[in-house]
Interface confidence: low
């Protein structure tokens, strides 16, 4: 087989690769960096001009079972006087993550990777004004 | 581990917890959601705490491309379009799970990896520390 060019995303398949049935992939769910912690500024969800709350969703057939979702508290943004300014908008910021879904079909169990869209917080934006002719 | 409800009629030999290694179907559910934040919204430009998006590419990871946010300013943009340093732009960080090829370069063998990404920025009131 030809050796791939540098910068190419096609590698030789090492002979040491584990055998995997067609249509499947082997996934070790022992998480690398499991104990890594988020080091965000303190209480930014309540100090933000677009504050948000957190909700924990729990699903025993999902790994990880807990996924935290943020919800913006206001439609507008909080101004210097602590009042809601509806000339600005609080909007959600979202990020994809992967989860493993466990599916039961009768007594057999299968596993499926799933992309989940997580709302991680909110930001304050200038609204887009649509002018009607 | 995570306890899984089991059909009471199934044999007891089934493990209630997620096993350490699983065989996963290659088709990722919801895989076609938009992964490029520049295409999905322009919040990064319209925010009072705007950010730039930096492409982080790693062929040994899935997804191979992740976009990292970097706040453009220390302060926030005020109504006049100027930077107000009485407020702070701070990154919103999130732990996400990705797949890491293990062993390296193998096409269909992965391990879950937790990585920390900055997703965007938000404008906050600063914490003022008064020195006695």
């Amino acid at each position: 087989r030809k050796i791939p060019k540098v910068g190419h995303t096609f590698f030789q398949k090492p002979e040491s690769c584990p055998p995997v049935p067609g249509g499947s992939m082997k996934l070790d769910i022992g998480i690398i960096n499991e104990n890594q912690r988020v080091s965000m500024s303190r209480n930014i969800e309540s100090r933000s001009t677009s504050p948000w709350n957190y909700t924990v969703t729990w699903d025993p057939n999902r790994y990880p079972s807990e996924v935290v979702q943020a919800q913006c508290r206001n439609l507008g943004c909080i101004n210097a006087q602590g009042k809601e300014d509806i000339s600005m908008n609080s909007v959600p910021i979202q990020q994809e993550t992967l989860v493993v879904r466990r599916k039961h079909q009768g007594c057999s169990v299968s596993f499926q990777l799933e992309k989940v869209l997580v709302t991680v917080g909110c930001t304050c934006v200038t609204p887009v004004i649509h002018h009607v002719q | 581990g995570i306890t899984i409800p089991r059909n009471p009629g199934c044999p007891n030999s089934e493990d209630k917890n997620f096993p350490r290694t699983v065989m996963v179907n290659l088709n990722i559910h919801n895989r076609n959601t938009n992964t490029n934040p520049k295409r999905s919204s322009d919040y990064y430009n319209r925010s009072t705490s705007p950010w730039n998006l930096h492409r982080n590419e790693d062929p040994e990871r899935y997804p191979s491309v992740i976009w990292e946010a970097k706040c453009r300013h220390l302060g926030c943009i005020n109504a006049d379009g100027n930077v107000d340093y009485h407020m702070n732009s701070v990154p919103i960080q999130q732990e996400i799970l990705v797949l890491r090829r293990e062993p390296p370069h193998c096409p269909n063998s992965f391990r879950l990896e937790k990585i920390l990404v900055s997703v965007g920025c938000t404008c906050v009131t600063p914490i003022v520390h008064h020195v006695a």
């Epitope: 190419h8 096609f10 | 290659l26 990722i28 895989r31 062929p59 899935y62 997804p63």
Partner: nanobody, 122 residues
């Protein structure tokens, strides 16, 4: 810029066979794949093949029935489809890749043909 043109689609009865072809012009790629989209559904991975033709990957739903192959001298990709089922009805697309990475993810394919319709019905 690579151009991809699929052909060989059509109406076939359940249990029948079809052979799809995809003619590539322009730059040749290490890997290519077939993906399909049924009405109202997401585009899904069917099969992929490395540049040399040594490595092939199949979706569970087509394994043992479909065979992907390529003829590099003709710059052509093929999909031999046997034992067709009604659920195989879809528009089939040929697409290029920078490698056999994440073959199952439609977002990882770079160039797409216009598609060829396969209808399996009695």
């Amino acid at each position: 810029e690579v151009q991809l043109v699929e052909s060989g689609g059509g109406l076939v009865q359940p249990g029948g066979s079809l052979r799809l072809s995809c003619a590539a012009s322009g730059r040749t790629y290490d890997a290519m794949g077939w993906l399909r989209q049924a009405p109202g559904k997401e585009r899904e991975f069917v099969a992929a093949i490395s540049g040399s033709g040594d490595d092939t990957y199949y979706a569970d739903s087509v394994k043992g029935r479909f065979t992907i192959s390529r003829d590099n001298s003709k710059n052509t990709l093929y999909l031999q489809m046997n034992s067709l089922r009604p659920e195989d009805t879809a528009v089939y697309y040929c697409a290029t890749r920078r490698g056999l990475y994440y073959v199952w993810d439609a977002n990882d394919y770079e160039n797409w043909g216009q598609g060829t319709l396969v209808t399996v019905s009695s």
